[in-house]
């Protein structure tokens, strides 16, 4: 058993049929010695008396808010949560496996630049009695500070018969060094509590590996005289690191109709302009990627050919 | 070239060669990007490689003030990785595929280090740790980790030379 926060404790249980469970001793936070009784949740049934209460925690029915009273007055609470371990593996029932970029990916994180600011998100089908708490650091043995905000519900989607809820959190490295080569990864830890179930999820990454620039901005077209060709120009996204002579991007320019199966014109460039062939009912799209490190491409920025 | 007197390197040449290094480092093992090698107990391996750190003057301001500190750090790293790529980690079993770009990568690391340091001038170089894994699978894992680390190192070096070529070239 360990303390998650004040008056909230996590009991780690090996979860299998007829498991013996864990013996837990609760102590009432009071100077009083006599006349103390214990109850669980809303029940008035007295579970025991005395300053300490010893219980065998085996299942969710044994978890909950234990309260010690004296003469009708509440003295203190202890909330017990369960953390299940099945076949040596901690349960992951609360969050959905996003399966990208690999199986058992529960947390996904992205950064728009090298400033040390990043966003992580996760998915669940649970809509109520759900809380998250996020901590992060650079490195684990001698951790350097990363400050995370509160996790918030950022999107709701309908997936078949189920509703899916996306939560996200923004974090900022306290002393970021955008130009340096990272040697220690960022660690992100998410505590998830659903009713009386506790789970924790972690992710470890370098900012450079989670970079995904915003799409290029201000796409403009200039038809070339006596030609089917069009000069398309764009700018670096505002959110990208500066100076651009140091933090350079490379671009992919594509002309395509509405369907992905349609024919296309495609060209790669390090410049902020390119010449392509525009077709009626097609769009010109441009996306960006770090020029020197193969992290994710941005989403496309598009303008219609006409 | 970065010479003892502290004159400028051939920024544009360094830029071209460092960009080539980036391409080669990724083609040497593109799938490295999809392997979570941190799960495999990194500390004893890649913590020994030289990293371009915050105080090394490789940021735009540091380069403007005095690029020599940064260039020396990059040179150290190039020599370090060049030696690693020539060591039995890469030459031993399992043999690299004949079409592996590691050979080109090795030659390009040497080429860029020579651009930075001409004959007769020697910056101190970092000692290569004795990383001699006994098992072929350990060697394979070590290669992945070294290449992964090299990808990050050459990316910073390429940024430095691109910025130098754009803003510091005479």
């Amino acid at each position: 058993i360990w303390e998650l926060k004040k008056d909230v404790y996590v009991v780690e249980l090996d979860w299998y049929p007829d498991a013996p469970g864990e013996m837990v001793v609760l102590t009432c936070d009071t100077p009083e010695e006599d006349g103390i009784t214990w109850t669980l949740d809303q029940s008035s049934e007295v579970l025991g008396s005395g300053k300490t209460l010893t219980i065998q925690v085996k299942e969710f029915g044994d978890a909950g808010q234990y309260t010690c009273h004296k003469g009708g007055e509440v003295l203190s609470h202890s909330l017990l949560l369960l953390h299940k371990k099945e076949d040596g593996i901690w349960s992951t029932d609360i969050l959905k496996d996003q399966k990208e970029p690999k199986n058992k990916t529960f947390l996904r994180c992205e950064a728009k630049n090298y400033s040390g600011r990043f966003t992580c998100w996760w998915l669940t089908t649970i809509s109520t009695d759900l809380t998250f708490s996020v901590k992060s650091s650079r490195g684990s043995s001698d951790p350097q500070g990363v400050t995370c905000g509160a996790a918030t519900l950022s999107a709701e989607r309908v997936r078949g018969d189920n509703k899916e809820y996306e939560y996200s959190v923004e974090c900022q490295e306290d002393s970021a060094c955008p130009a340096a080569e990272e040697s220690l990864p960022i660690e992100v830890m998410v505590d998830a509590v659903h009713k009386l179930k506790y789970e924790n999820y972690t992710s470890s990454f370098f900012i450079r590996d989670i970079i995904k620039p915003d799409p290029p901005k201000n796409l403009q077209l200039k038809p070339l005289k006596n030609s089917r060709q069009v000069e398309v120009s764009w700018e670096y996204p505002d959110t990208w690191s500066t100076p651009h002579s140091y933090f350079s991007l490379t671009f992919c320019v594509q002309v395509q109709g509405k369907s992905k199966r349609e024919k296309k014109d495609r060209v790669f460039t390090d410049k902020t302009s390119a010449t392509v062939i525009c077709r009626k009912n097609a769009s010109i799209s441009v996306r960006a990627q770090d020029r020197y490190y193969s992290s994710s491409w941005s989403e496309w920025a598009s303008v219609p050919c006409s | 070239r970065a010479v003892p007197g502290g004159s400028s390197p051939a920024w544009t040449q360094c830029q071209q060669l460092s960009q080539k290094l980036c391409t080669l480092a990724w083609s040497a093992h593109p799938l490295v990007g999809h392997m979570d090698l941190r799960e495999e107990g990194d500390e004893e391996t890649t913590n020994d490689v030289p990293h371009i750190q915050c105080g090394d003057g490789c940021d735009p301001q540091g380069l403007r003030d005095n690029s020599q500190f940064c260039l020396q750090r990059i040179h150290q790293g190039l020599i370090f990785y060049e030696k690693l790529l020539g060591s039995d980690i890469f030459t031993g079993e399992p043999s690299l595929l004949p079409d592996s770009p590691v050979g080109q990568l090795h030659a390009s690391l040497l080429g860029l280090s020579q651009l930075l340091q001409p004959e007769g001038h020697h910056w101190e170089t970092q000692q290569i740790p004795s990383l001699s894994p006994s098992q072929p699978w350990q060697r394979l894992l070590l290669r992945f980790k070294i290449l992964r680390s090299l990808q990050a190192f050459v990316a910073v070096a390429a940024r430095v030379f691109a910025h130098g070529a754009a803003t510091l070239s005479p």
Partner: antibody, heavy 118, light 107 residues
Framework: QVQLVQSGAEVKKPGASVKVSCKAS????????LHWVRQAPGRGLEWMGW????????EYAPKFQGRVTMTTDTSTSTAYMELRSLRSDDTAVYYC???????????WGQGTMVTVSS | EIVMTQSPATLSVSPGERATLSCRAS??????LHWYQQKPGQAPRLLIY???QSTSGIPARFSGSGSGTEFTLTISSLQSEDFAVYYC?????????FGGGTKVEIK
């Protein structure tokens, strides 16, 4: 599968014109760009231009501008390349090729030998 | 127009050996570079597109790398059917241009 079958060899006199055909099969004709590339005997490859069968748009290499015309007939899924004012250095194998991507050549015809000789 | 230069013009290699073919562009073309193989009396066939992407059905011994102005086609272990002429082609800008070719012959 995608296939391009070209017309047979031609012998022409200098100053004449030649029209080479290229019949496509195995795909929707308007879904691919069509290019023409030529190769003089013992020489390298030379791009001549492209046509979009969907709308008839064309782009020709400056070297051939004014001397070449590329057309298509969607009813027969056939592309044509006409080269006028032939000279002896136009002697070459002329290839048509098709791709969904505009700028490189995935599927090639077998080639048509055009000999220009007086 | 962009001039593509291939080297060497002829490469003599023994079967089973590695062949490295070079292609240089007269200006930076990012990764807009494609490789073709042509055997005598046949049309060329696409091997590699956008510098390093392998065409489906092409043996894994063919690989491409490079960006900017310098590109390489590597054939790791030459088989008898690989002796042919290899062309690079740039697609950075029109007109599309080819290199002069590298003939890979049996040593």
């Amino acid at each position: 599968q995608v296939q391009l079958v070209q017309s047979g060899a031609e012998v022409k006199k200098p100053g004449a014109s030649v029209k080479v055909s290229c019949k496509a099969s195995g795909y929707a004709f308007t879904d691919y760009y069509l290019h023409w590339v030529r190769q003089a005997p013992g020489r390298g490859l030379e791009w001549m231009g492209w046509i979009d069968p969907e709308n008839g748009d064309t782009e020709y290499a400056p070297k051939f501008q004014g001397r070449v015309t590329m057309t298509t007939d969607t009813s027969t899924s056939t592309a044509y390349m006409e080269l006028r004012s032939l000279r002896s250095d136009d002697t070459a194998v002329y290839y048509c090729n098709a791709n969904k991507e505009l700028r490189y050549f995935d599927v090639w015809g077998q080639g048509t030998m055009v000999t220009v000789s007086s | 127009e962009i001039v593509m230069t291939q080297s060497p013009a002829t490469l003599s290699v023994s079967p089973g050996e590695r062949a490295t073919l070079s292609c240089r562009a007269s200006q930076s073309i990012s990764i807009n570079l494609h490789w073709y193989q042509q055997k005598p009396g046949q049309a060329p066939r696409l091997l590699i597109y956008f510098a390093s992407q392998s065409t489906s059905g092409i043996p894994a011994r063919f690989s491409g790398s490079g960006s900017g102005t310098e590109f390489t086609l590597t054939i790791s272990s030459l088989q008898s059917e690989d002796f042919a002429v290899y062309y690079c082609q740039q697609s950075n800008s029109f007109p599309l241009t080819f290199g002069g070719g590298t003939k890979v012959e049996i040593k």
